[in-house]
């Protein structure tokens, strides 16, 4: 058993049929010595008396808010949560496996630049009685500070018969050094509590590996005289690291119709303009990627050809 | 060329070669389909490699003030990786495929380090640690880790030379 926060405790249980469970001793936070009784949740049934209560925790019915009283007055609370371990593996019932970029990916994180600011998000089908708390650091043995905000519900989607909820959190490295080569990864730890179930999820990454620039901005077209070609120009996204002579991007320019199966024109460039062939009913799209490190491409920025 | 304590490097040449290094480093070990190396106990094997750190003057301001500190750090790293790529980690079993870009990568690391430091001038170089894995699978894992680490190192070096070519070239 360990303390998650004040008066909230996590009991780690091996979860299998007829498991013996864990013996837990609760102590009432009071100078009083006698006349103390214990109850669980809303029940008035007295579970025991005395300053300490010993219980055998085997299942969710044994978890919950234990309260010690004296003469009708509440002295203190202890909330017990369960953390299940099945076949040596901690449960992951609360969050959905996003399966990208690999199986058992519960947390996904992205950064728009090298400033040390990043966003993580996760998915669940649970809509109520759900809380998250997020901690982060650079490295684990001698951790350097990363400050994370509160996790918030950022999107709701309908997937077949189910509703899916996306939560996200923004974090900022306290003393970021954008130009340095990272040697220690960022660690992100998410505590998830659903009713009386506790789970924790972690992710470890370098900012360089989660970079995904915003799409290029201000796409403009200039038809070339006596030609099917147009010059398309764009600018670096505002959110990208500066100066651009140091933090350079490379671009992919594509002309394509509405369907992916349609023919296309495609060219890669380090410049912020390119000449392509425009077709009626097609769009010109541009996306960006770090020029020197193969992290994710941005989403496409598009303008119609006509 | 960058002479210790002295003149500017051939920024444009260094830019071209460092960008080539980036391409080679990624073709030697594409990201796709490989194990997540951080799960394999990264610390003890790749902590010894030289990293371009915050105080090394490789940021745009540091380069403007005095690029020599940064260039020396890059040179140290290039020599270090060049030695690693020539060591039995890469020459031993399992043999690299003959079409592996590691050979080109090795030659290009040497080429860039020579551009930065002509013969007869010496910057202090870092000792290469004795990483001698006994098992072929350990060697394979170590290669992946070294190449991943090299990708990050050459990316920073390429940014330095691109910025230098754009803003510090005479």
């Amino acid at each position: 058993i360990w303390e998650l926060k004040k008066d909230v405790y996590v009991v780690e249980l091996d979860w299998y049929p007829d498991a013996p469970g864990e013996m837990v001793v609760l102590t009432c936070d009071t100078p009083e010595e006698d006349g103390i009784t214990w109850t669980l949740d809303q029940s008035s049934e007295v579970l025991g008396s005395g300053k300490t209560l010993t219980i055998q925790v085997k299942e969710f019915g044994d978890a919950g808010q234990y309260t010690c009283h004296k003469g009708g007055e509440v002295l203190s609370h202890s909330l017990l949560l369960l953390h299940k371990k099945e076949d040596g593996i901690w449960s992951t019932d609360i969050l959905k496996d996003q399966k990208e970029p690999k199986n058992k990916t519960f947390l996904r994180c992205e950064a728009k630049n090298y400033s040390g600011r990043f966003t993580c998000w996760w998915l669940t089908t649970i809509s109520t009685d759900l809380t998250f708390s997020v901690k982060s650091s650079r490295g684990s043995s001698d951790p350097q500070g990363v400050t994370c905000g509160a996790a918030t519900l950022s999107a709701e989607r309908v997937r077949g018969d189910n509703k899916e909820y996306e939560y996200s959190v923004e974090c900022q490295e306290d003393s970021a050094c954008p130009a340095a080569e990272e040697s220690l990864p960022i660690e992100v730890m998410v505590d998830a509590v659903h009713k009386l179930k506790y789970e924790n999820y972690t992710s470890s990454f370098f900012i360089r590996d989660i970079i995904k620039p915003d799409p290029p901005k201000n796409l403009q077209l200039k038809p070339l005289k006596n030609s099917r070609q147009v010059e398309v120009s764009w600018e670096y996204p505002d959110t990208w690291s500066t100066p651009h002579s140091y933090f350079s991007l490379t671009f992919c320019v594509q002309v394509q119709g509405k369907s992916k199966r349609e023919k296309k024109d495609r060219v890669f460039t380090d410049k912020t303009s390119a000449t392509v062939i425009c077709r009626k009913n097609a769009s010109i799209s541009v996306r960006a990627q770090d020029r020197y490190y193969s992290s994710s491409w941005s989403e496409w920025a598009s303008v119609p050809c006509s | 060329r960058a002479v210790p304590g002295g003149s500017s490097p051939a920024w444009t040449q260094c830019q071209q070669l460092s960008q080539k290094l980036c391409t080679l480093a990624w073709s030697a070990h594409p990201l796709v389909g490989h194990m997540d190396l951080r799960e394999e106990g990264d610390e003890e094997t790749t902590n010894d490699v030289p990293h371009i750190q915050c105080g090394d003057g490789c940021d745009p301001q540091g380069l403007r003030d005095n690029s020599q500190f940064c260039l020396q750090r890059i040179h140290q790293g290039l020599i270090f990786y060049e030695k690693l790529l020539g060591s039995d980690i890469f020459t031993g079993e399992p043999s690299l495929l003959p079409d592996s870009p590691v050979g080109q990568l090795h030659a290009s690391l040497l080429g860039l380090s020579q551009l930065l430091q002509p013969e007869g001038h010496h910057w202090e170089t870092q000792q290469i640690p004795s990483l001698s894995p006994s098992q072929p699978w350990q060697r394979l894992l170590l290669r992946f880790k070294i190449l991943r680490s090299l990708q990050a190192f050459v990316a920073v070096a390429a940014r330095v030379f691109a910025h230098g070519a754009a803003t510090l070239s005479p």
């Epitope: 099917r228 070609q229 490379t250 199966r261 349609e262 023919k263 296309k264 024109d265 495609r266 060219v267 890669f268 460039t269 380090d270 000449t275 062939i277 077709r279 009626k280 | 073709s27």
Partner: antibody, heavy 118, light 107 residues
């Protein structure tokens, strides 16, 4: 199977015009760009121009501008290359090539030898 | 027009050898570079597109790399059917241009 079948060899006199054809099969003709590339004897490859069969848009290499016409007939799934004012240096194998991507060539015809000789 | 220079113009090699052909562009072309193989009396065949992307059906012994101005095609463990002429082609801008070709012949 995507295939391009070209018309047979031609012998022409200097100053004449040649028109060669390229019949597509195994795909929807207007879904691919069609290019013409030539290769003089023992020489390299030279791109001449392309057509979008869907709308008839064309683009020609400056070297051939004014002498070359590329057309496409979607009713017969056939592309054509017409080269006028022939000279001896136009002696070459002419290839049609197609791709869904505009700038490189995925499928090639077998080639048509055009000999220009007086 | 962008000039493409291939080297060497010919190379003699034996079955099992590793052969590397290089292609240099007269200006930076990012990764807009493609490789073709041509056997005598036949049409060219696409091997690699956008510098390093492999084509399904093309043996994995063919690999490409490079960006900017310098590119290479490597044939690992040359097979009898690989003796042919190889061309690079830039697609950075029109007119599309090819290298002069490299003939890989039997030693």
């Amino acid at each position: 199977e995507v295939q391009l079948v070209q018309s047979g060899a031609e012998v022409k006199k200097p100053g004449a015009t040649v028109k060669i054809s390229c019949k597509a099969s195994g795909y929807t003709f207007s879904d691919y760009y069609l290019h013409w590339v030539r290769q003089a004897p023992e020489k390299g490859l030279e791109w001449m121009g392309w057509i979008d069969p869907e709308n008839g848009d064309t683009e020609y290499a400056p070297k051939f501008q004014g002498r070359v016409t590329i057309t496409a007939d979607t009713s017969t799934d056939t592309g054509y290359l017409e080269l006028s004012s022939l000279r001896s240096e136009d002696t070459a194998v002419y290839y049609c090539a197609a791709n869904k991507e505009l700038r490189y060539f995925d499928v090639w015809g077998q080639g048509t030898l055009v000999t220009v000789s007086s | 027009d962008i000039q493409m220079t291939q080297s060497p113009s010919s190379v003699s090699a034996s079955v099992g050898d590793r052969v590397t052909i290089t292609c240099r562009a007269s200006q930076s072309i990012s990764i807009n570079l493609h490789w073709y193989q041509q056997k005598p009396g036949k049409a060219p065949k696409l091997l690699i597109y956008f510098a390093s992307q492999s084509i399904s059906g093309v043996p994995s012994r063919f690999s490409g790399s490079g960006s900017g101005t310098d590119f290479s095609l490597t044939i690992n463990s040359l097979q009898p059917e690989d003796f042919a002429r190889y061309y690079c082609q830039q697609s950075n801008s029109f007119p599309l241009t090819f290298g002069g070709g490299t003939k890989v012949e039997i030693k």
